[in-house]
Interface confidence: low
């Protein structure tokens, strides 16, 4: 997985009037990292992990940059023609990546009312847009605005790619982000489902990177996909991820079922707790 930095900026308009506030969320390697509130932007680390990345430093630089980006996006929204009455949103998502071979990727995407209408590869400076006439019109509005003055153009093309990568490299130097493998804690729980059946749930938490295999096996054989229910792999706020898988089994057959987990080349199996024991914890190294 490449290292990545993702900026998600949102501004709003009401009856064609652009609102003063904005919301910015920053994700580092897929994890919530920084957040700026709508009215007064103050870059806030999202959890202890984010604070650890740059130690005791203040977030003045990030606050300044994110505030500037919010102002830019508000101006962009003001230039979108034919806005209907009511509430509308303009969202700009910027992503930059550094791959293992040190190659880089950067992109920028604009969404109006949640619909993608314009994307740009910030390295190759290629613009792409969906085929719909609405998207084309919106894209023309925004691109014409970005063309209006050279300084703006510089900001929205060349500098964004470089700045995003510069910030990402700066964060990566903290070493916290470079911790590439954290094994999961696996918990197996059971709960009564209906007469004669129980639901068994296998939870994996605290792992990194996010790629994980989690599934139920009966007598060592994986259950079919449609007999299992999976949760999404989600950030847990500590720079790591969590997920779960559940299935329904007949009471009394618990010993035939195991939860199989594979992560970063390591694997383990975890039995269903018997009787009244609710949680079995297993943490492998």
């Amino acid at each position: 997985e490449p290292h990545s930095l993702r900026y998600n900026l949102t501004v709003l308009s009401w009856d064609g009037s652009v609102q003063s506030g904005f919301l910015t969320e920053v994700h580092l390697d897929g994890q919530p990292f920084l957040r700026c509130d709508r009215q007064k932007c103050r870059a806030k680390p999202q959890g202890q992990w984010a604070e650890d990345v740059l130690g005791n430093k203040t977030w003045d630089r990030e606050t300044r940059d994110l505030t500037g980006n919010g102002k830019d996006l508000r101006m962009t929204l003001a230039h979108i023609k034919d806005q209907k009455e009511g509430l509308h949103s303009l969202q700009e998502i910027r992503v930059c990546e550094i791959h293992e071979d040190n190659s880089t990727r950067s992109s920028q995407h604009f969404y109006y009312d949640g619909e993608l209408f314009l994307s740009q590869n910030l390295e190759t400076k290629e613009w792409t847009m969906p085929q719909s006439s609405r998207a084309q019109t919106l894209a023309m509005n925004v691109r014409n605005f970005l063309k209006e003055d050279a300084m703006k153009t510089k900001t929205h093309y060349h500098a964004m790619h470089a700045d995003c990568l510069q910030e990402l490299r700066r964060y990566l130097k903290s070493g916290v982000v470079l911790r590439r493998t954290v094994p999961p804690m696996v918990n197996v729980t059971r709960s009564e489902a209906s007469e004669g059946n129980i639901t068994v749930t296998c939870r994996a938490s605290g792992f990194y990177p996010w790629n994980i295999t989690l599934s139920w096996r009966q007598d060592g054989v994986s259950l079919s996909h449609d007999t299992q229910q999976w949760g999404d792999v989600l950030p847990d706020g500590n720079g790591t991820y969590q997920t779960w898988v559940a299935t329904r089994i007949c009471q009394g057959e618990e010993q035939r079922f195991t939860c199989y987990m594979e992560h970063s080349g390591n694997h383990s199996t975890h039995p269903v707790p018997s009787g009244k024991v609710l949680v079995l914890q297993s943490h492998w190294q």
Epitope: N121, E123, T124, K125, E126, W127, T128, K147, T153, H158
Partner: antibody
Framework: QVTLKESGPGILKPSQTLSLTCSFS??????????VGWIRQPSGKGLEWLAH???????YYNPSLKSQLTISKDTSRNQVFLKITSVDTADTATYYC??????????WGQGTTLTVSS | DIVMTQSPATLSVTLGDRVSLSCRAS??????LHWYQQKSHESPRLLIK???QSISGIPSRFSGSGSGSDFTLSINSVEPEDVGVYYC?????????FGSGTKLEIK
């Protein structure tokens, strides 16, 4: 109407420097997002992208030839230039310039032929 | 660098045939793939942009498909003027590599 036209020396001796000019009309290289690239094609062979210059004076080169290439522009005169130092017979080819606006080369010049021979 | 591989090298077809030309990228390039046609003694001409988007002035018999690393250019009824070499191009990242080309000829 967009047009591009390449010009060059036609014939060079090995180790000499090749200077190419692309003169264009119908668009401006000061327009944001605009770029002009050079592509070459040895006779009977495929296309090889060489270099690219953007409206903001950013320049990109083919890594395998980077040390030999220099691309530049004169925005006011609607011209883009390419220099290739120390040419040899492998550089014998037709050289095209092409406009690149949205990630693809949408207009091409007619090409100028270079022969490198001692 | 991203390597673009085209096949076949030469395609001999009968007028009116529907033909498919293949292009494969050495890594995923999403839909950043463009097709060009080059007739004998002429400059290349853009046929399809972004894998499947049509270009104004290009006959509707030309179409493109694919995403990721496998792409196809289709001509649904070959006409005499379609003879030439067809190139695919990676527009995803520098350097902007081209495939080696597929030569279309009439039997």
């Amino acid at each position: 109407q967009v047009t591009l036209k390449e010009s060059g020396p036609g014939i060079l001796k090995p180790s000499q420097t090749l200077s190419l000019t692309c003169s264009f009309s119908g668009f401006s290289l000061s327009t944001s997002g605009m770029g002009v690239g050079w592509i070459r094609q040895p006779s009977g062979k495929g296309l090889e992208w060489l270099a690219h210059i953007w409206w903001d004076d950013d320049r990109y080169y083919n890594p395998s030839l980077k040390s030999q290439l220099t691309i530049s522009k004169d925005t006011s005169r609607n011209q883009v230039f390419l220099k290739i130092t120390s040419v040899d017979t492998a550089d014998t080819a037709t050289y095209y310039c092409a406009r690149r606006l949205n990630g693809y080369f949408d207009y091409w010049g007619q090409g100028t032929t270079l022969t490198v021979s001692s | 660098d991203i390597v673009m591989t085209q096949s076949p090298a030469t395609l001999s077809v009968t007028l009116g045939d529907r033909v498919s030309l293949s292009c494969r990228a050495s890594q995923s390039i999403s839909d950043y793939l463009h097709w060009y046609q080059q007739k004998s003694h002429e400059s290349p001409r853009l046929l399809i942009k972004y894998a499947s988007q049509s270009i104004s002035g290009i006959p509707s018999r030309f179409s493109g498909s694919g995403s990721g690393s496998d792409f196809t250019l289709s001509i649904n009824s070959v006409e005499p003027e379609d003879v030439g070499v067809y190139y695919c191009q990676n527009g995803h990242s520098f350097p902007f590599t081209f495939g080696s080309g597929t030569k279309l000829e009439i039997k």
